[in-house]
């Protein structure tokens, strides 16, 4: 008697870019001798019950080929991470996984003064975004002036993985001579968001 | 024979409704995702909408969305599309089909809607 | 949205001639690519699928390449019936699939 098999082919790729809040679906055929009798997705070592299906190609009884979809809607950057596929039949299991990375705008974790002088800025979304400073003298509302951060770094995300990127930059609030206020932007190739430091009151945050 | 059969088409007017309906036969219907495909007359084709076999996940094409509804009957074999608030711009002929992985395997002959005052 | 085009938009050709018709995505899409065959006034037809796999029932004179934005079906010796019209479409971003525009193969 020949010996059962599991051929897995993603039918779309394995590493997935998804936007914040859109639909994907991971969908994989596979072909399985003798029929496969259990399949499963797993999240995080997490099981789904629903947002999936199992059909077969046709339903001749000669039939070894099937497919299997996971519906995952409205996808959140928590979400990201290993999306596992496993099949098996009475002779053997085989799985696949998909990469999902959730793009993610970026959003300001925090904007302080420090006691050195330095104005830090820590921002975090996928991919990792980008901070810009920018001077604007007095009451002006645009800031156009841009400024040399002192210091960037990628930090790490203490979420899981394929979570958002942390950044931190730096800049010498010693280096302005007026009052005035500056901007801290932070982008990617989501969207942007900025937080400004007035000189002559206490910072705000203004997400745009 | 695996068959898929479309009605309901026909002319209506802007801002009106219609509701297609798609006849199955020949598999196991609510085995598999279906889904509706349009193409205006001499163009391509363009993705509708796709519905899980259970009927719980329904997306949508950004042109349709918050105007078509996608639905089935399982114990009828059957699948349908609820259009309101029509334009000029869905003027196509629309079909059926059966899904299979990310393209359509089984195909329906198509229902002609027009959109016209 | 990933663009799918074709080239050619039409192309004439004779009964055994080798057919070639090319498809490019906007974006990589790996081989998630399906290409459908259609007749004026009938449905769309599955011919390939995942770039390169023939659905069942189609000849074997149809065939699929192709990996990352340019994809070919290519059509080895054309037959009678083999006159119609062509479209690709990607699954890469399921569930927003997308068409190509089409490419129309007439008898010369």
């Known amino acids: 008697v020949d010996k059962g098999f599991i051929n897995i082919f993603p039918m779309i790729n394995t590493t997935v870019f998804v936007n914040d809040g859109e639909n994907v679906d991971l969908i994989v055929e596979y072909e399985a001798f003798p029929k496969p009798e259990h399949q499963q997705w797993i999240y995080m070592n997490r099981t789904f019950t629903d947002k999936w299906e199992d059909y077969p190609k046709s339903e001749n009884e000669s039939n070894i080929r099937y497919v299997s979809e996971l519906h995952l809607t409205r996808l959140k950057g928590t979400e990201g991470g290993t999306y596992t596929f496993l099949v098996s039949n009475s002779d053997v299991n085989a799985a696949i996984a998909f990469n999902v990375y959730v793009n993610t705008k970026p959003e300001i974790l925090t904007y302080d003064r420090l006691v050195n002088g330095m104005l830090q800025c820590v921002a975090a979304g996928f991919p990792e975004p980008t901070i810009d400073w920018y001077f604007c003298p007095g009451t002006e509302q645009r800031c156009s002036a841009s400024v040399l951060p002192v210091d960037v770094q990628t930090l790490n995300s203490s979420g899981p993985p394929f979570g958002k990127l942390v950044v931190q930059s730096s800049i010498d609030s010693s280096a302005f001579k007026h009052n005035g206020t500056v901007e801290c932007k932070a982008y990617n190739d989501v969207g942007k968001t900025s937080a400004y430091f007035n000189f002559a009151f206490k910072e705000q945050i203004h997400p745009h | 024979e695996v068959q898929l059969l479309e009605s309901g088409g026909g002319l209506v007017q802007p801002g009106g409704s219609l509701r297609l309906s798609c006849a199955a036969s020949?598999?196991?219907?609510?085995?598999?995702?279906m889904a509706w495909v349009r193409q205006a007359p001499g163009k391509g084709l363009e993705w509708v909408s796709v519905?899980?076999?259970?009927?719980?996940?329904?997306p949508y094409a950004d042109s349709v969305k918050g105007r078509f509804t996608i639905s089935r009957d399982n114990s009828k074999n059957t699948l349908y599309l609820q259009m309101n608030s029509l334009r000029a711009e869905d003027t196509a002929m629309y079909y059926c089909?059966?899904?299979?992985?990310?393209?359509?395997?089984?195909w329906g002959q198509g229902t002609t809607v027009t959109v016209s005052s | 949205d990933i663009q799918m085009t074709q080239s050619p938009s039409s192309l004439s050709a004779s009964v055994g001639d080798r057919v070639a018709i090319t498809c490019r995505a906007s974006?990589?899409?790996?081989?998630?690519l399906n290409w459908y065959q259609q007749k004026p006034g009938k449905a769309p037809k599955l011919l390939i699928y995942?770039?390169?796999k023939l659905e069942d029932g189609v000849p074997s004179r149809f065939s699929g390449s192709g990996t990352g934005t340019d994809f070919t079906l290519t059509i080895r010796s054309l037959q009678p019936e083999d006159f119609a019209s062509y479209f690709c479409?990607?699954?890469?971003?399921?569930?927003?699939?997308?068409f190509g525009p089409g490419t129309k193969v007439e008898i010369k």
């Open positions: 089909a059966r899904r299979y992985g990310g393209g359509m395997d089984v």
């Open positions: 020949g598999f196991t219907f609510s085995s598999y995702p």
């Open positions: 519905i899980s076999s259970s009927g719980g996940y329904t």
């Open positions: 974006q990589s899409i790996d081989t998630y």
């Open positions: 995942a770039a390169s």
């Open positions: 479409q990607q699954s890469y971003s399921s569930p927003g699939i997308t």
